[in-house]
Every structure is written in C-alpha cells, then in structure tokens.
C-alpha cells in the first residue's frame, strides 16, 4: 500500500504529565456461538519477578483518522502509544514530574506494544468512489521488554517464558511493525 512510517518502535515519546489513561474498552460484540470455551486472551504479565508491578510503562491514548490512498475513515479511531522507556512503577510519575527518568544500570528496558486488536473501519472516498471496509491493526496495550543488545529491536526479550497454550489464551502480539504503518492524521493527540 506504500504507507509512510507513522511511528517507529525506537522513537521515544515523552509522555504528558497526569494520570495513566485506561486502555480502550474491548470491542462490543455478540459473537459467542463458535468461540473456544473460556475464550479470550488473559492479561499478559511479562514480569516474572517478585513484584509484578516492579516495572511499568505508560500507555497514552491518541485519536486519529486512518487513510487508505485517497480514502479516510468515517470516524477517528483511538489507540495507544507506548512511551519509550520503562522504569520502576513507583518512580515513574514523580521522576517524570521532576524531568528525570529512571534508567537501569544493566540492560535497557523498552516500553513497546504488547497486544494488538482489530477494529473495523469504513473508509469514505472522494469523487463518488464506493466506500471501503477494512480492519485496522491497533495497539491495545504496552509492556516492558528487555533490550539485550543495544538498540536492536529484534532482540527484545520478555521477562518470562512461554509454553504451548490454547490460542484462546494466546500471548498477545508483542511488537509493532513500523514498516507498514499508515499515513495517519493526528487528531486530539493524548
């Protein structure tokens, strides 16, 4: 589709001051007939440390229209942007407020997309062209990952390990694909 890169995993976004926004609500649907029993993804907890909340990263909402060539979504979509750096949860708000940032002395920790979700969008096109329907890939949540080699995004590692599991409880998609991002119009960012 020739999309320009919209955001890059390595780009650090400095979060605004203020409270941590809630992730967007799950899409409402009534598709229950053929679901796997107890379906749905459980919350993913990559921090297999003594304190699950030891590391934290910020999830910020932003709202934008999505485009496909000359066509634009009828309504804006809301997704999350993940701030670039991770730190102990208890330090993040104050440290940001003081203009400082906690950095680990050992491996680098990055805040990157964890879960993705699909959202149906209708795209309106100019010149009487028929509308289009697409399913857009949106960031649904963020997580901290350890960067074992400096600035090598392919080396991002989870805190924990994984084994075989039913897809109904599968691990969410772990990272964004910036190479295929779209030409987005930022609207009411954050």
């Amino acid at each position: 589709q020739g999309w320009q890169a919209f955001k890059n995993d390595a780009t650090e976004i400095i979060p605004e001051l203020g409270e941590y926004p809630e992730p967007p609500p799950e899409l409402e649907n009534n598709k229950t007939m053929n679901r796997a029993e107890n379906g749905g993804r459980p919350p993913h907890h990559p921090f297999e440390t003594k304190d699950v909340s030891e590391y934290s990263c910020r999830e910020l909402h932003f709202t934008r229209y999505v485009t496909d060539g000359p066509c634009r979504s009828a309504k804006p979509v809301t997704e999350l942007v993940c701030s670039g750096q991770c730190g102990p949860a208890r330090l993040l708000p104050n440290a940001i407020g003081r203009g400082k940032w906690w950095r680990p002395s050992g491996p680098d920790f990055r805040c990157i997309p964890d879960r993705y979700r699909a959202q149906r969008v209708q795209l309106l096109c100019p010149g009487g062209e028929a509308p289009r329907a697409r399913k857009v890939r949106l960031v649904a949540s963020c997580k901290c990952k350890r960067l074992t080699r400096f600035h090598n995004q392919s080396e991002l590692k989870d805190f924990g390990t994984e084994a075989a599991r039913p897809q109904k409880g599968r691990k969410p998609r772990p990272r964004a694909r910036s190479a295929k991002a779209n030409q987005a119009e930022l609207e009411n960012a954050y």
């Epitope: 697409r134 857009v136 039913p166 998609r173 694909r177 991002a181």
Partner: antibody, heavy 121, light 109 residues
Amino acid sequence: EVQLVQSGAEVKKPGASVKVSCKVSGYTLSELSIHWVRQAPGKGLEWMGGFDPEDGETIYAQKFQGRVTMTEDTSTDTAYMELSSLRSEDTAVYYCATDSAGYWYKFFQHWGQGTLVTVSS
Amino acid sequence: QAVVTQEPSLTVSPGGTVTLTCGSSTGAVTIDHYPYWFQQKPGQAPRTLISDTDDKHSWTPARFSGSLLGGKAALTLSGAQPEDEAEYYCLLDYGGSFVFGGGTKLTVL
C-alpha cells in the same frame, strides 16, 4: 516475508486423533493470526477455525466444534491443529494460513504447503 | 451456517473478459463481508488474489479486479491468459467466522 512449513503426511485409523504442525518463520507466531483450512480430495476449501483479533479469541467453524483444538507454542513459533474422532470423510489436505502482519488485517495471505491426512481402517 | 455460492464452472477465451460471482444465503454481500478471492491450481496451495472486496496484492496480476455487483462479490478477469485456468474460491467473513464458496472452475479455451 512470512513462511509456513507444515508437518508431513499422516495415516490414521477411524476414531483416532491427528495433530498437524505449522512452523512460522519470518515473523514470530505471536505476531500473526493463524487459520486452518482443509480440502478433501477433489473438493473445495473448507475453513476450520482461527484466531479472531477483533475480540481476541479463537473461533471454530460450527462443523468442527468439540472435535478441533488449535494451540501454539510461541517458544518454537509453531501452531498446531488437532482433530479428534477421525472419520474417513476427514481425509483431506490440511493447510495453515496467516495474515501478512501489515497495518490492515488481511487474513489468508500466506499458506503452508499442506499436510495430507488419510483416515483409513 | 451461511452458504456461499459460486458458479461451478465458467469458460473464457484467451484475451476475453469473464466475471465470477459470490453470493450469500443470508442476503446481499456487502463490504462488511470483506470478500476474499483465491486462485488454486492443481497440486498447489491456494493463493490470495483479492482481499476486502477490491484490494489487490503485490503478486496479483493487474488483469484481476474485485468489486460488488448486484448484491454479490465479483472477481473480474480482463484479458484472460492460459495460465489463469484454475479453480477460484471466494471467502466471506461473517463476524470473524469465515465461509468459503464451492469454487469456480475457470477454463481458458
């Protein structure tokens, strides 16, 4: 580029189970939405089930409910499809297929080479 | 479960134009069914030609196009080539559950 490599052909007896594997390369399995499709000899394609990212669940075709289980091992980037209580009409080539991990969700973009499962007494 | 219908077979002359259609037992096919079209040649896995009604892929020849036509999804082949002789399947999305059509055997003669 996403590539899918499936396990080899299987011969099973009626009533048995079969587990077909689908090894992902080019992306990690967690980044993709895997679906399973089968094709009986000389017949058309039949969707069995797959992961629906709209509400984060695996959804199975009604016809296979209770007989099929789709799992994954993210440590080896391998997806599995297990079909139980096999009957002769389950003889088919079983395909895994996945999206292309792009900005728009487009499913069934990449296909495995297929695994022939023969059910015969 | 919905039934998706296609013409069992169609014939086109080399260089000619042919339209394959895909209907749904539940009513008119719309963009919200995200129609897919696949081509399959004997002994090969299917390959996607069209997604989301009209979206071609990098490997889709320009002579193929997707659309909605009279309450059905349609695949139009303009300027048929001998190598286009194959089975063609449509696929419709019913809220995350997918149903394939029975397939159309296209002969280029």
